[in-house]
């Protein structure tokens, strides 16, 4: 009987010789369960796992914290991974976060992280980030040192407030900080002096939403 | 253009009590996610003193707590900070902004600001 080839991520679908973009089935560490996920195999070198995706606002982002967990949307359009899948797999070996970011006004730039994990749900999915390069700004717009998870159902932040409620959209809400990927989707020309837009605060400043961002994940030693 | 005013400061004495008033024109507050007051001191950095967010909830310094209190007209596109048992230690210059991201309690993620409304507290 022939062996069942599994992949834990995208960077090892690379290696097995799959060097197309497109959605593969990865399968969580220690585990048979399964999950879809896009995975880039052609920007910076391939082996990209996509964790986060958003384009054209076709996706409601306002969801529940077991939403969050599980993942939601299209891996080939707007979708969110889910966190207990990247939790694993972040705790297994070291991993790199580069979130990609484009403007309205046809501009791209990114943010790489050198090392990122989620802590466990009982840890609210902690983020922990260290080792900041790129062109989306010099200090991070993910506050640091890491927050817990939030959503409008599971209120972890550092603030007195709801945030994921207000700015809308499960994020690692400080008080409420300078960024949401998750937030409400605005079109063009209706971007700007917007609170709970797509927000990347030290790229495009006060109150810009964004056109599209995507967060992906790879192994540290690829 | 947005503009932010300020009004109501003066000179009172300790323990007395003053509202101050901050109109917006060009925007409406409800579009902000957090409207505040920050005061600065002669000699001393810009520092946190109220504010309200989109949602109605409120924020305050531990130095105001309990004698300050923020609030917010709709209809007249107006936020307003009663300050009562005033002490000499609240003399400063009260400014108004709002701001669309970041944390409530640094100046720095505020986008728009008000000229600013003088208090004095004397003895």
């Known amino acids: 009987k022939e062996e069942q080839i599994s992949f834990r991520d995208c960077a090892e679908v690379f290696k097995s010789g799959h060097t197309t973009n497109g959605i593969y089935t990865l399968t969580f560490p220690n585990s048979t369960e399964e999950i879809k996920a896009y995975c880039d195999m052609e920007a910076g070198g391939g082996g990209w796992t996509i964790i986060q995706r958003r384009e054209d606002g076709s996706v409601d982002f306002q969801r529940t914290w077991k939403e969050y967990k599980v993942g939601f949307g299209n891996p080939s359009g707007e979708y969110w991974l889910g966190n207990e899948f990247v939790s694993q797999l972040t705790n297994q070996q070291r991993y790199v976060l580069k979130i990609h970011l484009k403007d309205w006004e046809g501009n791209e730039a990114y943010s790489l992280y050198e090392h990122f994990y989620l802590s466990s749900e009982e840890l609210n999915y902690r983020i922990h980030l260290k080792g900041l390069t790129g062109t989306a700004g010099k200090i991070s717009s993910i506050s640091q040192p890491g927050n817990d998870f939030s959503t409008k159902d599971g209120d972890n932040d550092k603030c007195i407030c709801k945030c994921s409620q207000m700015l809308t959209g499960g994020w690692w809400f400080d008080a409420c900080g300078p960024s949401n990927l998750n937030g409400m989707y605005y079109p063009q020309r209706q971007n700007t002096n917007k609170f709970n837009g797509i927000k990347w605060y030290y790229w495009k400043g006060s109150g810009y939403s964004l056109k599209a961002t995507t967060m992906m994940i790879r192994p540290a030693d690829f | 253009e947005v503009q932010l005013v300020e009004s109501g400061g003066g000179l009172v004495q300790v323990g007395d009590s003053l509202r101050l008033s901050c109109a917006a024109s060009?925007?409406?507050?409800?579009?902000?996610?957090?409207v505040g007051w920050f005061r600065q001191a002669p000699g001393k950095e810009r520092e946190f003193a109220a504010g309200?967010?989109?949602?109605?909830?409120?924020a305050y310094a531990d130095s105001v707590r309990g004698r300050f209190t923020i609030s917010r007209d709709n209809a007249k596109n107006t936020v307003y900070l009663q300050m009562n048992s005033l002490k000499t230690e609240d003399t400063a210059v009260y400014y108004c902004?709002?701001?669309?991201?970041?944390?409530?309690?640094?100046?720095?993620?505020?986008?728009?600001w008000g000229q600013g409304t003088l208090v004095t507290v004397s003895s």
């Open positions: 902004a709002g701001s669309y991201d970041g944390n409530y309690y640094i100046p720095g993620f505020y986008k728009d």
């Open positions: 060009g925007r409406t507050f409800s579009t902000y996610l957090m």
């Open positions: 309200i967010w989109s949602s109605g909830d409120t």
